[in-house]
Interface confidence: low
Amino acid sequence: QLPPGKPEIFKCRSPNKETFTCWWRPGTDGGLPTNYSLTYHREGETLMHECPDYITGGPNSCHFGKQYTSMWRTYVMMVNATNQMGSSFSDELYVDVTYIVQPDPPLELTVEVKQPEDRKPYLWMKWSPPTLIDLKTGWFTLLYEIRLKPEKAAEWETHFAGQQTEFKILSLHPGQKYLVQVRCKPDHGYWSAWSPATFIQIPSDFIMNDEQKLISEEDLGGEQKLISEEDLHHHHHH
């Protein structure tokens, strides 16, 4: 029977800069029941607090609701593991909510095949930002990434959409059923999970153009851009 091993706070994430959750890995239990507590203070302030909510984030977690989340402040936190033989502390973790945002996936992904009379057909995608993100505050610049692949293919084709919430792709395989997903990230932060896949059947008469892909932003009030295959690969994010 020994004191508990050193725990480790391994991840903190916020969906929207208004709340956040941190998770820790327990160390060895020393063969005895072990209690864990997370304590924190805000850098530049002095009073240390205990985790306000050990439940919401699941086992070995601490959730900070709106009332306990301060923007632009660094939180200094550590986990204390205690059993009958003694205690051990994790290393201190410094957390700035601004840099741990991982949004929910974008919503309402709509995918359509457009076949205008005067232009080549294209695949048109549209989506909405996650509901928890208030873009009006100016706190967020959300960037989007789209991926798509034929249903039976192993490899995804990925496109960086910038801040657009619409995207158009010309070069697709006729007659194939495609899966399409979108994800987002704030300018400082983590990519969301991919949205649920949307399926779209590409018609057999879809005209494919290998040399260039036309991405039209006219619906967004922008200009048409002729983007080469090389340029698209430059925007490819892994």
């Epitope: 507590s37 304590t39 240390m48 607090h49 009332q67 306990y68």
Partner: antibody, heavy 116, light 107 residues
Framework: EVQLVESGGGLAQPGGSLRLSCVAS????????MSWVRQAPGKGLDWVGN????????NYVDSVRGRFTISRDNAKNSLFLQMNSLRAEDTGVYYC?????????WGQGTLVTVSS | DIQMTQSPSSLSASVGDSVTITCRAS??????LDWFQQKPGKAPKSLIY???ILQGGVPSRFSGSGYGTDFTLTISSLQPEDFATYYC?????????FGPGTKVDIK
């Protein structure tokens, strides 16, 4: 059990000096900020100042800045308040307090009387 | 400095009464507020921190609420041991400042 025991209070002349001590037990002293708070007879509580875990930062209320110095000795679990240029209005009970996770813990206080 | 005011400065109540004490900050302090109880000749005792989190071992009849500048401490059913003076304190910015206190005595 957290315990804080203050000592060093007593009678001092205006302009004189006193050094208060606070010995801590029952928690990891070096992990926490420490504060001094005082209470004039029959009056409310006044925050005097505090000191960071490693002693590298102190903060003071304006009325004592330049006259009082807070220090600590983590090896001895001890907190100190050096009071110079004492004034009548410094009279009161002086408490040391830990700013611990679940709120503050306080000692029982030591009385400082500044009078000629 | 942030000024803290409390009202009322004193109140008389009976055992079983519900009592509410108000604390107001001169500027926004978010939820950086503590409540303390002090009995004559004794050190203050921490009741609530971060405006609404009950200190370990404090009876659930005590509750705190508020955010920004206006805060309340409520004792839902006053017990004989609750007759004391109650202080709020802000720790948003230095210097930390206490309210002047509210004395709760027996009617």
């Amino acid at each position: 059990e957290v315990q804080l025991v203050e000592s060093g209070g007593g009678l001092a002349q205006p302009g004189g000096s006193l050094r208060l001590s606070c010995v801590a037990s029952g928690f990891t002293f070096s992990t926490y900020w420490m504060s001094w708070v005082r209470q004039a007879p029959g009056k409310g509580l006044d925050w005097v100042g505090n000191i960071k875990q490693d002693g590298s930062e102190q903060n003071y209320v304006d009325s004592v800045r330049g006259r009082f110095t807070i220090s600590r000795d983590n090896a001895k679990n001890s907190l100190f308040l050096q009071m110079n240029s004492l004034r009548a209005e410094d009279t009161g009970v002086y408490y040391c307090a830990t700013l611990l996770t679940k709120g503050d813990y306080w000692g029982q206080g030591t009385l400082v009387t500044v009078s000629s | 400095d942030i000024q803290m005011t409390q009202s009322p400065s004193s109140l008389s109540a009976s055992v079983g009464d519900s009592v509410t004490i108000t604390c107001r900050a001169s500027q926004d302090i978010s939820n950086y507020l503590d409540w303390f109880q002090q009995k004559p000749g004794k050190a203050p005792k921490s009741l609530i921190y971060a405006a609404s989190i009950l200190q370990g071992g404090v009876p659930s009849r005590f509750s705190g609420s508020g955010y920004g500048t206006d805060f309340t401490l409520t004792i839902s059913s006053l017990q004989p041991e609750d007759f004391a003076t109650y202080y709020c304190r802000q720790y948003k910015t230095y210097p930390f400042t206490f309210g002047p206190g509210t004395k709760v005595d027996i009617k």
